[in-house]
Amino acid sequence: MAVTACQGLGFVVSLIGIAGIIAATCMDQWSTQDLYNNPVTAVFNYQGLWRSCVRESSGFTECRGYFTLLGLPAMLQAVRALMIVGIVLGAIGLLVSIFALKCIRIGSMEDSAKANMTLTSGIMFIVSGLCAIAGVSVFANMLVTNFWMSTANMYTGMGGMVQTVQTRYTFGAALFVGWVAGGLTLIGGVMMCIACRGLAPEETNYKAVSYHASGHSVAYKPGGFKASTGFGSNTKNKKTYDGGAHTEDELQSYPSKHDYV
């Protein structure tokens, strides 16, 4: 039961995390105009990975896409790449983990196969979360650097009569969404990896089972011992040796002939 709960929770947490990563990637507020030193502007500037926007005090918002690839900073391109890789890995991980869930039956899929799929999706979620966290952190670092550079320019460029107000940018909502989402995806991935350990059939269990079975008048198939190698139809083997040393979790997972996807 604990394994199913861990796997299910890991899936849900990762699902929320990946949804958050997608949301963060699409959001326009990666960087927002810093109003701390300049609260008098009648416009509010904010920027995303794909476009920059200006909200006027009149209420009108105008957004312009970055319609160039070559003219964009390499760091921005890197952040885009990291977020997209995170989304793609996360999406594949979700797809794999759906089939790996214990509560879902696909034909006669073995627990060992489900364990492998759970581990694969877990690793994918971990990498996806790390990509998102890395992407957001790179962007945040870029903002901090630019913030202090523009602050320095503010105080050194006051010599002339005509002043140009520097628009400084600070952390936008998307950064926090991205960090949290990346963290959730990472946690979900770790939970999937933990669940994988509980799903994997243990060799000792099956040896104990086989000895126990030999004392019964049960006609077992020769394929029964294949379970110990991690291959073969272990779900059917388990059904044969019903009196063995199984966990409560394993007992509940036995499919009947009426179990379908």
């Epitope: 008098v40 312009r64 005509v162």
Partner: antibody, heavy 118, light 113 residues
């Protein structure tokens, strides 16, 4: 047709208060900010502040803060400006104007003339 | 506060002539976010409220004759009337739309000879 109809002329004594109105029609009142501008006779224009009818949130020019109070009433699509502690310096025409794209005032009221005299 | 300086304070031209008036701001009115200049031009005829002519430094308001042209960027702006008409007799004001408090220039009075 967009219209901003301001209240009639006012003759008030020094130290008194005056409340003028600006009734909007021809558009959705809560979608546009209303600004107030002062113009002394034969002089230029001076921005007093604005009221956001959607949020009822005002913003003032520091020069007029404390003496000007901007409010609005959604039900009647009317913006109000109350001016207190009037002096002869406050004798002017007061305009309300709608703020549009580009932060520009595209429609103006006809103005309310306020004369402060004892 | 942003100081808007208009010049000349008044000018007198004959109908059909081209006229250009200047407006300088003490700070740049160019917003980096959208590369747009937040400056407006208004026309005020005697006994009337101001009328919006140009916003965004160069965008003509709908219904405004195309003889009115706004130009400039940053701190230096101009309003040009390509062929002055008798009905153009008015005071022209420029206004900072980017920073609070919104500030107006002292105006350029246009007289027709």
């Amino acid at each position: 047709e967009v219209q901003l109809q301001e209240s009639g002329p006012e003759l008030v004594k020094p130290g008194a208060s005056v409340k003028m109105s600006c009734k909007a029609s021809g558009y959705t009142f809560t979608n546009y900010i209303i600004h107030w501008v002062k113009q002394k006779p034969g002089q230029g224009l001076e921005w007093i502040g604005y009221i956001n009818p959607y949020t009822d949130g005002p913003k003032y020019n520091e020069k007029f803060k404390g003496r000007a109070t901007l409010t609005s009433d959604k039900s009647s699509s009317t913006a109000y400006m109350e001016f207190s502690s009037l002096t002869s310096e406050d004798s002017a025409v007061y305009y309300c104007a709608r703020l549009n794209r580009g932060n520009a005032m595209d429609y103006w009221g006809q103005g309310t003339s306020v004369t402060v005299s004892s | 506060d942003i100081v808007m300086t208009q010049s000349p304070s008044s000018l007198s031209v004959s109908a059909g002539e081209k006229v250009t008036m200047s407006c300088k701001s003490s700070q740049s009115l160019l917003n980096n976010g959208n590369q747009k200049n937040y400056l407006a031009w208004y026309q005020q005829k005697p006994g009337q409220p101001p009328k919006l002519l140009i916003y965004g430094a160069s965008t003509r308001e709908s219904g405004v004759p195309d003889r009115f042209t706004g130009s400039g960027s940053g701190t230096d702006f101009a309003l040009t009337i390509s062929s002055v008409q008798a009905e153009d007799l008015a005071v022209y004001y420029c206004q900072n739309d980017l920073y609070y408090p919104f500030t107006f220039g002292s105006g350029t009075k246009l007289d027709i000879k």
